[in-house]
């Protein structure tokens, strides 16, 4: 019986070039967390394993930092980072719990002003 629930940061927005923390929290279960996977669409971003600690996928090493906690920090954001992110908790004996976060990366206000006004 899966009694747990995942609370996430929900729908969030951040500025291009900035950073954002993706956070999930599993509650209402005594199940043992063996691993947390962070995924974006079909891509694995990072893993936090109970035995081995953190592993960041090589293609994201430059822009992804582990933590805080079981969360994930995305850095140097681009508009291409806009989309769905999933935290997947592997637990025993419950199985997998999945949380969803939607991130929208906005053009920074500086960039917008720069495009709108020409500096003489």
């Amino acid at each position: 019986m899966m009694t747990g629930t995942i609370e996430t940061t929900g729908n969030i927005s951040a500025e291009k070039g900035g950073s954002i923390i993706l956070q999930c929290h599993l509650s209402s279960t005594t199940a043992q967390v063996t691993q947390v996977n962070w995924e974006q669409q079909d891509q694995l971003l990072a893993i936090c394993n109970a035995d081995l600690g953190w592993h960041i996928s090589p293609s994201f090493k430059d822009r992804v930092a582990p933590g805080p906690g079981l969360g994930l920090t995305l850095q140097s954001l681009t508009v291409n980072d806009t989309g769905e992110y999933f935290c997947i908790y592997h637990t025993y004996p419950d199985g997998t719990y999945t949380g969803r976060i939607f991130l929208e990366v906005l053009e920074s206000s500086v960039a917008e002003h720069g495009a709108r006004f020409q500096i003489p």
Partner: antibody, heavy 119, light 107 residues
Framework: EVQLVESGGALVKPGGSLKLSCAAS????????MSWVRQTPEKRLEWVAT????????YYPDSVKGRFTISRDNAKNTLYLQMSSLRSEDTALYYC????????????WGQGTSVTVSS | DFQMTQTTSSLSASLGDRVTISCRSS??????LNWYQQKPDGTVKLLIY???RLHSGVPSRFSGSGSGTDYSLTISNLEREDIATYFC?????????FGGGTKLEIK
């Protein structure tokens, strides 16, 4: 090349004990969770046990809990399954497999070792 | 426990055929569905994980689809080396249960 080679299968009497081994090579054994899966004479596959990469966590279905113990020696690249209080329904071909949590699947399997429980 | 059912226990097809093998779970498994191939000599290989993702080295003629409780494995152009028994397995919740298998034979 990933290789998993099981050994230790035998004919044992009901109530008896047996220890299976699985020698791993071709990958960093200590980085992966491992599992035992068995195939019954009726050809059904059943998950038997899983152990985390460092050996800190072990998991079993109710059918073997308290009778089977999965363990590993990362220095020897070897996985074990200690089976006790064996029953006729434990008769099966026992496979060891690498359990990849990033795939949610067992990505490599050995060739199996046969266990027969009969008087 | 999640029950996995493969209603077709054996299937006969001709070389070059398109073959579909079905699997149903007793509860929603959120696409945590894997397919394994067992050759007549007992060798087991992972073909597809998470419903549709091809494992490394698996020919592209294999594909998977489905959602919720209904899943399928398709072989688009049957080759002699595909003669085997195919098992589905749910990876969502322990115990990680398997279907009963579908044995594929050549007509």
């Amino acid at each position: 090349e990933v290789q998993l080679v099981e050994s230790g299968g035998a004919l044992v009497k009901p109530g008896g004990s047996l220890k299976l081994s699985c020698a791993a090579s071709g990958f960093t054994f200590s980085n992966y969770a491992m599992s035992w899966v068995r195939q019954t004479p009726e050809k059904r596959l059943e998950w038997v046990a899983t152990i985390s990469s460092g050996g800190s966590y072990t998991y079993y279905p109710d059918s073997v809990k308290g009778r089977f113990t999965i363990s590993r020696d990362n220095a020897k690249n070897t996985l074990y399954l200690q089976m006790s209080s064996l029953r006729s329904e434990d008769t099966a071909l026992y496979y060891c497999a690498r359990w990849l949590l990033s795939l949610y699947a067992m990505d490599y399997w050995g060739q199996g070792t046969s266990v027969t429980v009969s008087s | 426990d999640f029950q996995m059912t493969q209603t077709t226990s054996s299937l006969s097809a001709s070389l070059g055929d398109r073959v579909t093998i079905s699997c149903r779970s007793s509860q929603d498994i959120s696409n945590y569905l894997n397919w394994y191939q067992q050759k007549p000599d007992g060798t087991v290989k992972l073909l597809i994980y998470r419903t549709s993702r091809l494992h490394s080295g698996v020919p592209s003629r294999f594909s998977g689809s489905g959602s919720g409780t209904d899943y399928s494995l398709t072989i688009s152009n049957l080759e002699r080396e595909d003669i085997a028994t195919y098992f589905c397995q749910q990876g969502k919740t322990p115990p990680y249960t398997f279907g009963g298998g579908t044995k594929l034979e050549i007509k």
